[in-house]
């Protein structure tokens, strides 16, 4: 089956700065600010645009070893990033792939809102465990908070 999941997370960081750091420079920044979650991000093909393949290796203590992601769209003007998890033990034996869209919009009172849309493709007509969907959101939120803390402490960067 196919299952959709939506989530929103507020951030105190303005949209342009957050996109520049969390998304565009995330391959370098995230392993630096959250080494307890992600140990490395390796670009194994492509220039960062659509079609680029990345291998992400999780840190010791995380219940997954690695994922392979494909970049589907990078929209710098609208702070939008689409990518698909195409391989890895995170998919388990029931998922074919998971596509995510991350869109950062300005929040009315300053800061921004990170909107995440996800589509889970299960093998055959399996159901997708709600906890699995929630888990993906929690992982993204943990990484976002680590980036946010870094940006608050390093105000001259990613402006």
């Amino acid at each position: 089956g196919v299952f959709n999941y939506e989530a929103e997370t507020p951030s105190v960081i303005p949209a342009a700065r957050l996109f520049k750091s969390y998304v565009l420079d995330g391959d370098k920044l995230i392993p630096k600010v959250a080494p307890q979650v992600i140990s490395s991000v390796e670009n194994v093909g492509g220039n960062g645009g659509p079609g680029t393949i990345k291998n992400i290796t999780f840190a010791e203590g995380i219940p997954f070893k690695f994922v392979k992601e494909r970049v589907d769209e990078v929209d710098n003007a609208n702070f939008k990033y689409n990518y698909t998890v195409i391989e890895g033990d995170v998919l388990g034996d029931k998922l074919e792939k998971v596509s995510h869209e991350l869109k950062i919009v300005a929040a009315p009172g300053g800061g921004s809102i990170v909107k995440i849309s996800s589509k889970f493709h299960a093998k055959g007509y399996h159901e997708v465990n709600a906890e699995k969907m929630k888990g993906a959101k929690e992982m993204a939120e943990k990484l976002l908070r680590a980036v946010e803390s870094y940006l608050l402490a390093h105000t001259a960067e990613y402006n």
Partner: antibody
Amino acid sequence: EVQLVESGGGLVQPGGSLRLSCVASGFTFSNYDMNWVRQAPGEGLEWISYISYSDHNIYYIDSVKGRFTISRDNAKNSLYLQMNSLRAEDTAIYYCAREALASSSFDYWGQGTLVTVSS
Amino acid sequence: EIVMTQSPATLSVSPGERVTLSCRASQSVSGNLAWYQQKPGQAPRLLIYSASTGATGVPARFSGSGSGTEFTLTISSLQSEDFALYYCQQYNKWPRTIGQGTKVEIK
């Protein structure tokens, strides 16, 4: 530029068959789920069928189950709808619609092809 | 199946006015809802997905809100090109279902 072009519509008698095609361009067709949506004259939109990017998952609305078959050929960037045992109530404009990668909203639509079932 | 009910069926408004369209689901669809615009003789166009996210290229005057069973599409200041039919669609459960539409016409 994303483009979806439907063809195969026309006039058919009740009980007859038609095969609709939708040719896609401007994107990697094999990455995307696809749908058929129809619109009877002067009426609203009705989703009728879905096929996943890999064709491992297929869904239909109850009223066309057993009569319509959705399929795709990723090598030809094409989506199909085989319609058998057609009824007067199947008369409509048939649109093929691309499903967004990360949500099941329909982000691009073809211009539609008209199917008229009448004796 | 989930029944989507839109109200009103027709809305007569003047250019420049603020417009609010409603969509109600017969059971919760979480945030898995889209809005489309359709003009006569044309295919539908995606405006909003995930209940509140604007599709690429859609003017900022269009906004969506709501979750669960109650949703709203707002056009902050109606332009002449906005007179059209508007549909909501849920994609939380199979079958995908679409509301009967709201026609926004010139007063």
